[in-house]
């Protein structure tokens, strides 16, 4: 077992006066046994903020069930923050003994009494949309102070201009929220695209927060179909392929119909991915023309991502192929599943 480390993931925490500050601390091991204590400041004059083992700390609550042996989260919440609470807080692990001995300290979390915006959350439309459609994305960030804040939208690094932003409330408040809606026109090449909402605030020291949305979760690129007849593979057998190109997402079901009757249904599995993130897929049907007296209308029907089916047909001439005596079967195969259906 590796030696225990005390992890304080936040180098700094900024909190508005009157609110609660959560100071995160986790340990990487359950060994050694012993209490956790929180201090403000370092050295002999450090101030005890919380002792897991004993004492009364009315403003401090533990975030998780810290009395249990399996607990590794020793984060605390300090209520009713005032400017006097500013400082660096250390989470310190002790080894059980008489007396308990200090084992390891976290790196510290600096608490400043002002408020950063929360990480921007970008959300897109509930339903997918197809290229050439305009969709709306929203970006929200909360809990910041002071009120002055800058929000920008980007698509693949290019700044967008069609958006509206509101900061609430209008009057004085302990903290503020920002809400912005941007309009984005989808293109067929947007599967790999990202929409980014960037928030800059004085508390962020010039390092803006970003929220992202992948257009892969928003876009639907419908497939194009092409049905072609391949050269005859063997006597009386014709290979017909249906090329399904440039579709996204992958969820696709293909049905072959012979003269309007369902011949086979399959789901796209082994697809190839294009550079733009869309997919191609090919299905093929081996038709025994000797099983047909008349011309055959072969139809490739595709249902993509739950949308209404699209289809493409191909007329197969059988007049040049006299039917063999005693045969009334059609053999069908897929490239990955060689089987005859009688």
């Amino acid at each position: 077992e590796e030696e225990l480390q005390v992890i304080q993931p936040d180098k700094s925490v900024s909190v508005a006066a009157g609110e609660s500050a959560i100071l995160h601390c986790t340990v990487t091991s359950l060994i050694p046994v012993g209490p956790i204590q929180w201090f403000r400041g370092a050295g002999p004059a450090r101030e005890l903020i919380y002792n897991q083992k004993e004492g009364h700390f009315p403003r401090v609550t533990t975030v998780s069930e810290s009395t249990k042996r399996e607990n590794m989260d020793f984060s605390i919440s300090i209520s009713n923050i005032t400017p006097a609470d500013a400082g660096t807080y250390y989470c310190v692990k002790f080894r059980k003994g008489s007396p308990d001995t200090e084992f390891k300290s976290g790196a510290g979390t600096e608490l400043s009494v002002r408020a950063k915006p929360s990480a921007p959350v970008v959300s897109g439309p509930a339903a997918r949309a197809t290229p050439q459609h305009t969709v709306s994305f929203t970006c929200e960030s909360h809990g910041f102070s002071p009120r002055d804040i800058t929000l920008k939208w980007f698509k693949n690094g290019n700044e967008l201009s069609d958006f509206q932003t509101n900061v609430d409330p209008v009057g004085e408040s302990v903290s503020y929220s920002i809400h912005s809606t941007a309009k984005v026109v989808l293109t067929r090449e947007d599967v790999h695209s990202q929409v980014i909402c960037e928030v800059a605030h004085v508390t962020l020291q010039g390092d803006p927060l970003r929220g992202t949305a992948n257009l892969s979760e928003t876009i639907r690129v419908p497939p194009t179909l092409e049905v072609t007849q391949q050269p005859v593979r063997a006597e009386n057998q014709v290979n017909v392929t249906c090329q399904v190109r440039k579709f996204y997402p992958q969820r696709l079901q293909l049905t072959w119909l012979e003269n309007g009757n369902v011949s086979r249904t399959e789901t796209a599995s082994t697809v190839t991915e294009n550079k733009d993130g869309t997919y191609n897929w090919m299905s093929w049907l081996l038709v025994n023309v000797s099983a047909h007296r008349d011309d055959v209308k072969l139809t490739c029907q595709v249902e993509h991502d739950g949308q209404p089916a699209v289809s493409k047909s191909h007329d197969l001439k059988v007049s040049a192929h006299p039917k063999e005596q005693g045969s009334n079967t059609a053999a069908e195969n897929t490239g990955s599943n060689e089987r005859n259906i009688y």
Epitope: L30, K53, G97, S98
Partner: antibody
Framework: EVQLVESGGGLVQPGGSLRLSCAAS????????MHWVRQATGKGLEWVSV???????YYPGSVKGRFTISRENAKNSLYLQMNSLRVGDTAVYYC????????????WGQGTMVTVSS | DIQMTQSPSSLSASIGDKVTITCRAS??????LAWFQQKPGKAPKSLIY???SLQSGVPSKFSGSGSGTDFTLTISSLQPEDFATYYC?????????FGQGTKLEIK
């Protein structure tokens, strides 16, 4: 519900062996130190052994070299292999979870009786 | 090994009484002391850990105090179900050791 259930007790002759089991349920077994405690009839409690979450073990002098504690986290099971048994080992054996952050016992099993007699 | 000595060994009290049991360690154990209750034919039940912290589900009529070598368990108002044997235990270092027990009987 957090539960510990001991089994494997019985009558054994002096010098014989016995293996006790403790089946744990209702908690993340691998995250707790586990202990065996025994109690002779009409007597007090005596701590017998511990196995830590990392597999480290400790015993008092009275059983050291004769008893072996082990655990099988995948089966949520604790064991006590008792060899070279003596009449003085006759007792009810309890398994207990070091369930508090400081390894204080919080949950006990119902116990299993071990009788060493010729 | 750390020796734990309980007193008294037995105690008679009436319903509603407040009783105190003491436990002394042969050396400083900080506050790594637990108290257990045991009724005849039953497994021990955990009451208190780190000298004064109540285990989950234990009624607040039980309280513990002390640090170093001297500790006490107090039951504020005895009820019939409280008559049992009580044990203290140090768990600051191995081997963990128990007191010899205090039998609390109805007067």
């Amino acid at each position: 519900e957090v539960q510990l259930v001991e089994s494997g007790g019985g009558l054994v002759q002096p010098g014989g062996s016995l293996r006790l089991s403790c089946a744990a349920s209702g908690f993340t077994f691998s995250s707790y130190d586990m202990h065996w405690v025994r109690q002779a009839t009409g007597k007090g409690l005596e701590w017998v052994s511990v196995i830590g979450i990392a597999g480290d073990t400790y015993y008092p002098g009275s059983v050291k070299g004769r008893f072996t504690i082990s655990r099988e986290n995948a089966k949520n099971s604790l064991y006590l292999q008792m060899n070279s048994l003596r009449v003085g080992d006759t007792a009810v054996y309890y398994c207990a979870r070091g369930g508090s952050w400081d390894d204080a016992f919080d949950i006990w099993g119902q116990g299993t009786m071990v009788t060493v007699s010729s | 090994d750390i020796q734990m000595t309980q007193s008294p060994s037995s105690l008679s009290a009436s319903i509603g009484d407040k009783v105190t049991i003491t436990c002394r360690a042969s050396q400083d154990i900080n506050n790594y002391l637990a108290w257990f209750q045991q009724k005849p034919g039953k497994a021990p039940k955990s009451l208190i850990y780190t000298a004064s912290s109540l285990q989950s589900g234990v009624p607040s009529k039980f309280s513990g105090s002390g640090s170093g070598t001297d500790f006490t368990l107090t039951i504020s108002s005895l009820q019939p179900e409280d008559f049992a044997t009580y044990y203290c235990q140090q768990y600051v270092s191995y081997p963990y050791t128990f007191g010899q027990g205090t039998k609390l009987e109805i007067k």
